[in-house]
């Protein structure tokens, strides 16, 4: 069913990292335009990206209202230049997305090592607490603010002169590790949400090594 000469969207896909969330779909439109609606299970559908020829729609502003809710989006197809036209059933053609729960499914972005500081045989490594687009009381929350203790970081570290890696974990954004005096070490971190069943881990951060500008050394 549906409007003559329009085709339904397909391959509706959520692309989400640190709650920045975009819905993508196919096909590239030929003589048609799209409007997207999004809703929680309440069925209070909100329209976005009106009559667009794009095949993506940024839904971040909607999902950050409550990242624990489960969302569904639907993409309506209309004939270009005649968006009031409907199909034989009096309904425009549409397709539903998969369900999407941001808290459980948004990808964890690549973390960044903010700094490291050596004091004797200990090194304190700090992970940057990235800001998200989730708001509370008119302020943007950090990744740690949103996930709390559900979010851990894994530190991989190794002597610059060898390849044997060690690991450490923290449920804050800081590590305090023991190192051999006089040795330079390299570091990489990964964000992990162990309780998740999908998208549990981020990609590894860029490697940072002692003796470079991010570090500080004190006896």
């Amino acid at each position: 069913s549906g409007t003559t000469n329009t085709v339904a969207a397909y391959n509706l896909t959520w692309k989400s990292t640190n709650f920045k969330t975009i819905l993508e779909w196919e096909p590239k439109p030929v003589n048609q335009v799209y409007t997207v609606q999004i809703s929680t299970k309440s069925g209070d559908w909100k329209s976005k990206c009106f009559y667009t020829t794009d095949t993506e729609c940024d839904l971040t502003d909607e999902i950050v209202k409550d990242v624990n809710q489960t969302y569904l989006a639907r993409v309506f197809s209309y004939p270009a230049g005649n968006v009031e036209s409907t199909g034989s059933a009096g309904e425009p053609l549409y397709e539903n997305s998969p369900e999407f729960t941001p808290y459980l499914e948004t990808n964890l972005g690549q973390p960044t090592i903010q700094s490291f500081e050596q004091v004797g045989t200990k090194v304190n490594v700090t992970v940057e607490d990235e800001r998200t687009l989730v708001r509370r009381n008119n302020t943007f929350l950090s990744l740690r603010d949103v996930f709390g203790k559900d979010l851990i970081y894994t530190l991989y570290y190794w002597k610059s002169s060898s390849s044997g890696k060690k690991t450490a974990k923290t449920n804050t954004n800081e590590f305090l590790i023991d190192v051999d005096k006089g040795e330079n070490y390299c570091f990489s971190v990964q964000a992990v949400i162990p309780s998740r069943t999908v998208n549990r881990k981020s990609t590894d951060s860029p490697v940072e090594c002692m003796g470079q500008e991010k570090g500080e050394f004190r006896e």
Partner: antibody, heavy 118, light 107 residues
Framework: EVQLLESGGGLVQPGGSLRLSCAAS????????MSWVRQAPGKGLEWVSS????????YYTDSVKGRFTISRDNSKNTLYLQMNSLRAEDTAVYYC???????????WGQGTLVTVSS | DIQMTQSPPSLSASAGDRVTITCRAS??????LAWYQQKPEKAPKSLIY???SLQSGVPSRFSGSGSGTDFTLTISSLQPEDFATYYC?????????FGQGTKLEIK
Amino acid sequence: EVQLLESGGGLVQPGGSLRLSCAASGFTFSNYAMSWVRQAPGKGLEWVSSISGSGDYTYYTDSVKGRFTISRDNSKNTLYLQMNSLRAEDTAVYYCARSPWGYYLDSWGQGTLVTVSS
Amino acid sequence: DIQMTQSPPSLSASAGDRVTITCRASQGISSRLAWYQQKPEKAPKSLIYAASSLQSGVPSRFSGSGSGTDFTLTISSLQPEDFATYYCQQYNSYPYTFGQGTKLEIK
């Protein structure tokens, strides 16, 4: 555990009115669309009406438009169906159901019988 | 309105049998279809939504398939508690409509 408990059914004369209630518990009521579905004796299921979580959007089957009104009180976790100008063909068990996105019906009450007869 | 036609209207089978019930929509509804089970004097129970997604708590012997206009509900190995009436429902567009039901009886 999701629980839906209908009440307000009974015997009413043609042309009369009745108000059904559905008390919800075990979930965040305002987060879900809700629906009424009915089943005439010995017959199949018929969707009657749906309402969004905010109450801003309501939908009805053609045969009850203008006679039935669906509403909800989220502060009381209660769904309502005001039925006016009742007809013999409205006789049925009326079920309240939770309706994610206003789509399918994932949890149902036990039903309340409405009999329209003189 | 979209008409939903179920077949067969009734079906006799034995415990352990594999059973398939079909539902046809009068126009395309993509995957916007649900299946319900109802036992005598009881409220319906949700089995399947989005044509093939199993409702939480429903045994895996139940499965759904199809898209567009033709859909099936399959019970891979009938259990005694599965004898009931089954309904399909489209939620593509209002008014939502149900099939007339398929009564599954013990042979």
